[in-house]
């Protein structure tokens, strides 16, 4: 029983900083209770960007002062990723978990390379 | 950097109970899924339990089910694990380690802490 | 609860020389969610590998892992001094979570 996560391979951000993209998942077992995590891997260094747990069902909420904001319908879920810079560019990994009831399964996908151009300034006008 | 120190191991009487604590440092405690690991005596490694992030979640091995419980305070970065109703076959050195990241393989280990069950 | 098999049980071999660990789980280990540890006497055990070839910090890289599903393997390239001890494979793709019994490589 493997838990499978598909995302897209490449994702281009807005000019306004702005990243959105799909987490799907193939759940092994009937989980009410799902955990998604993003993750950016930056020279074989990971970090955790954002977190957030729902109930299935129920709307994903992550903390107030995330960067991230997400919907969910079924298996699938829809993640913004907001503030980007250009310094911010590289690999976001969604790690699906299935936290209740046990037992728990793991899922994580192949990542999404996020490009992010910071906008040239607007020239001085007279 | 990342420092998990165990303590409350002993000798213990079989059917009494212990409880094991584990102060954690170096790192956002809540952020990451927490076990506790066993190894008896001359003997190779055991998952116990696992509690995730904010501690609502919890898992064990069949071994332990319904004697131990595992639980962690955020606020404090501690993690706990009740032992009761102990067995001799529950002797063994105690590994609070921490989950990785990438899923719950073990990237930090503490030192141990021996519990002894025996008359 | 996913079963794993480790062999052989003990390996000799002499410094320089390269060690290779086999790792049978008796179901498909999902994505490769398989870990490899090391553990000397009287120390807690230290994480090699993770995700069946991703080397964990401060690796050397004469330590590489390999395979997926049910077969998996840990290769040193050549063994030093220090790297005789026992090692752990461990599966966490599911609940339980579930070592190997492990395999002692010792000096030959």
């Known amino acids: 029983k493997a838990m499978h996560v598909a995302q897209p391979a490449v994702v281009l951000a807005s000019s306004r900083g702005i990243a959105s993209f799909v987490c799907e998942y193939a759940s092994p077992g009937k989980a009410t209770e799902v955990r998604v995590t993003v993750l950016r891997q930056a020279d074989s260094q990971v970090t955790e960007v954002c977190a957030a747990t729902y109930m299935m069902g129920n709307e994903l909420t992550f903390l107030d002062d995330s960067i991230c904001t997400g919907t969910s319908s079924g298996n699938q879920v829809n993640l913004t990723i907001q503030g980007l810079r250009a310094m911010d560019t590289g690999l976001y990994i969604c790690k699906v978990e299935l936290m209740y009831p046990p037992p728990y399964y793991l899922g994580i996908g192949n990542g999404t390379q996020i490009y992010v151009i910071d906008p040239e300034p607007c020239p001085d006008s007279d | 950097q990342v420092q998990l120190v165990e303590s409350g191991g002993g000798v213990v009487q079989p059917g009494r109970s212990l409880r094991l604590s584990c102060a954690a440092s170096g790192f956002t405690f809540s952020s990451y899924g927490m076990h506790w690991v066993r190894q008896a005596p001359g003997k190779g490694l055991e998952w116990v339990a696992v509690i995730w992030y904010d501690g609502r979640n919890k898992d064990y091995a069949d071994s332990v089910k319904g004697r131990i419980t595992i639980s962690r305070d955020n606020s404090k970065n501690t993690l706990y694990l009740q032992m009761n109703s102990l067995r001799a076959e529950d002797t063994a050195v105690y590994y609070c380690?921490?989950?990785?990241?990438?899923?719950?393989?073990?990237?930090?280990w503490g030192q141990g802490t021996l519990v002894t069950v025996s008359s | 609860e996913i079963v794993l098999t480790q062999s052989p049980g003990t390996l000799s071999l002499s410094p320089g020389e390269r060690a290779t660990l086999s790792c049978r789980a008796s179901q498909s280990v999902s994505s490769s969610y398989l870990a490899w540890y090391q553990q000397k006497p009287g120390q807690a055990p230290r994480l090699l590998i993770y995700g069946a070839s991703s080397r964990a910090t401060g690796i050397p890289d004469r330590f590489s892992g390999s395979g997926s599903g049910t077969d998996f393997t840990l290769t040193i390239s050549r063994l030093e001094p220090e790297d005789f001890a026992v090692y752990y494979c461990q599966q966490y793709g599911s609940s339980p979570f579930t070592f190997g019994p492990g395999t002692k490589v010792d000096i030959k």
């Open positions: 380690a921490r989950g990785g990241l990438l899923g719950p393989y073990f990237d930090y």
